[in-house]
């Protein structure tokens, strides 16, 4: 049961299907619903993500005849698969030969800072977004994507890498965040929970969504991912929350219908090219933005996160398929693959719209504590 619709302006009201799917009071997590991952983790329970590192995770970007400059993405160290932050049976972990420093998993040993010291950094991701405290920044104009509608051929690689399902994207997908901030998309992947348990990485006022999509981009200022790691704005991730809606999402179905083929960790399949932009919300003008990190080892900082205000709707069956089909390491289900929210440590989240003026029932007194000094268009 959901509360009446929020107005168009309320943060995170409505999915890209056009229906509003507001967060009602009953959608806020109760004490017992809030798993320990929601607190900034200590060394022992540091979990993580960002599906960038790993040999299998980074495509080599080849030049595209006259349309594309020459790009080479150097492979990063392999990153091993996660366990499950809440399920002890998911703690089994297989070592890969000769891969010592690159093992990590969700919720257990080894502590992530031991895998990568950057995981103990001050400006990590994901974070809890509090719209009331976001700084309205008129300079944040609508995002622009170019080349995201892919033809069926060539096919794309869809892989279960043990910690997510990842779709490798071909060259030619460009994304613009504004002056001096042009990017090329590399891959997309998802984060999810388990039956009845949400699994988004970012949260909104403590509310965790059922799932989250990340589209990972490399700045055009860098030829390779390893050059961009840790550099401010070197990488950018578009993130959107996935929510339950009444209808099947046909764009997602093109991927979800193939998950059974890659149920086993490390398996992959080829899927026809699809409209990648259809996996994202339709409103590119309203979003939150902040500088954070990859959400798995190596946890490199300097990543520009853009989190859409609008959510994407999937059917209950589709969300179930996402969370209940894949297997991770050690004969454990691949579930709850999200990192705990990390402290802002003084960072200000910017909003492209006045998110502090919220008409939802949860907003008692709209207060805009932070402001953005940049001018608009």
């Amino acid at each position: 049961q959901r509360l009446p619709r929020m107005q168009e302006d309320s943060p995170l009201g409505g999915g890209s299907s056009g229906e509003d799917d507001p967060l009602g009071e009953e959608d806020l997590p109760s004490e017992e619903d809030s798993p320990r991952e929601e607190d900034p983790p200590g060394e022992e329970d540091l979990p993580g993500e960002e599906d960038l590192p790993g040999e299998e995770d980074l495509p080599e970007v080849k030049p595209k005849s006259e349309e594309e400059g020459s790009l080479k993405l150097e492979d990063l160290p392999t990153v091993e698969a996660p366990g499950d932050p809440q399920e002890p049976q998911n703690n089994a972990h297989r070592d890969k030969e000769g891969d010592d420093q690159s093992h990590w998993r969700y919720g257990g040993d080894p502590p992530w800072p031991r895998v990568s010291p950057a995981c103990a950094g001050r400006f990590q991701s994901p974070v809890d977004i509090r719209p009331q405290l976001a700084a309205f920044c008129p300079a944040l104009r609508p995002l622009e994507l170019l080349g995201f509608q892919l033809p069926p051929l060539p096919e794309l690689r869809l892989r279960n890498n043990g910690h997510s399902v990842q779709l490798t994207l071909p060259p030619g997908l460009e994304m613009a965040l504004g002056p001096g901030r042009e990017y090329r998309a590399l891959q997309l992947h998802l984060h999810w929970g388990a039956a009845g348990r949400p699994g988004s990485e970012h949260t909104v006022e403590g509310h965790r969504f059922p799932a989250e999509i990340h589209v990972v981009h490399l700045s055009t200022a860098f030829a390779r991912v390893d050059e961009a790691l840790g550099r401010p704005g070197g990488l950018a991730v578009l993130a959107a929350f996935l929510e339950e809606g009444p209808e099947e999402n046909s764009a997602y179905e093109q991927l979800l219908s193939r998950l059974e083929e890659i149920a086993e960790e490390g398996s992959e399949t080829q899927v026809p090219g699809l409209d990648i932009s259809a996996l994202l919300p339709s409103d590119f003008s309203r979003y939150f933005q902040y500088e954070g990190s990859l959400t798995t080892p190596p946890c490199a900082q300097g990543v520009i996160w853009t989190v859409f205000n609008q959510t994407v709707m999937l059917s209950a069956k589709q969300l179930h398929t996402l969370s209940d089909t894949l297997w991770g390491p050690g004969d454990s289900r691949l579930q709850l693959n999200f990192r705990a929210t990390q402290p802002l440590n003084g960072r200000v989240i910017e909003a492209s719209f006045p998110a502090g003026v919220d008409s939802s029932p949860r907003a008692a007194e709209p207060v805009q504590l932070n402001s953005c000094l940049a001018a608009g268009d």
């Epitope: 594309e68 104009r141 170019l146 995201f148 509608q149 042009e182 055009t220 409209d275 259809a278 994202l280």
Partner: antibody
Framework: DVKLVESGGGLVKLGGSLKLSCAAS????????MSWVRQTPEKRLELVAA????????YYLDTVKGRFTISRDNAKNTLYLQMSSLKSEDTALFYC????????????WGQGTSVTVSS | DIQMTQSPSSLSASVGDRVTITCKAS??????VAWYQQKPGQAPRRLIY???NRYTGVPDRFSGSGSGTDFTLTISSLQAEDLADYYC?????????FGGGTKVEIK
């Protein structure tokens, strides 16, 4: 004030060559994507070629691939379009266009230079 | 290629009238649509980007709306100086394509 001034158009024989130039002023040229757009005698608009800020990425309309080359000289604040093997269907008014800073949409257009391919 | 089908191809309206021009994309272009105005003998001039965002200096009688495949340019109160051709354009996928244009005449 943003200013884009095209030159180099004219009457050319079928199969001939022509080089168009676009002199830019009033903005930091090296920060912007630039394009050539043509308008046919029937007033139809077509994006002919585009180039990113450092010249590393180029795009061409299928019908001009291999015949046209877009380039830029950021030191001279100039955009070029080298056209060869010209066909009668290349007859058009060619505009140089600037893209919004950091984005793909176009925000300023020059006044255009006319290219007529005759047999 | 993505086709942009613009309608009507021409219209005649009186000063003060509300004028609506539509553009239909042959596939999803999200919000990557721009609208341009071209007055006789002049180059196209920017009006709208990202489907609904008006450029600085563009009178607020011009507004854009739509997303996905259906887009609209509205002139809320037509003025004599709005006599021009209007074009929509998608920049979601190469090749960027334009609508065929709408000629707006004043009665």
């Amino acid at each position: 004030d943003v200013k884009l001034v095209e030159s180099g158009g004219g009457l050319v024989k079928l199969g001939g060559s022509l080089k168009l130039s676009c002199a830019a002023s009033g903005f930091t040229f090296s920060n912007y994507y630039m394009s050539w757009v043509r308008q046919t005698p029937e007033k139809r608009l077509e994006l002919v070629a585009a180039i990113n800020s450092d010249g590393g990425i180029t795009y061409y309309l299928d019908t001009v691939k291999g015949r046209f080359t877009i380039s830029r000289d950021n030191a001279k604040n100039t955009l070029y379009l080298q056209m060869s093997s010209l066909k009668s269907e290349d007859t058009a008014l060619f505009y140089c266009a600037r893209h919004r800073s950091g984005y793909f949409s176009m925000d300023y257009w020059g006044q255009g230079t006319s290219v007529t391919v005759s047999s | 290629d993505i086709q942009m089908t613009q309608s009507p191809s021409s219209l005649s309206a009186s000063v003060g009238d509300r004028v609506t021009i539509t553009c239909k994309a042959s596939q999803n272009v999200v919000s990557a649509v721009a609208w341009y105005q071209q007055k006789p003998g002049q180059a196209p001039r920017r009006l709208i980007y990202s489907a609904s965002n008006r450029y600085t200096g563009v009178p607020d009688r011009f507004s854009g709306s739509g997303s996905g495949t259906d887009f609209t340019l509205t002139i809320s109160s037509l003025q004599a100086e709005d006599l021009a051709d209007y074009y929509c354009q998608q920049y979601s996928n190469y090749p960027w394509t334009f609508g065929g244009g709408t000629k707006v005449e004043i009665k």
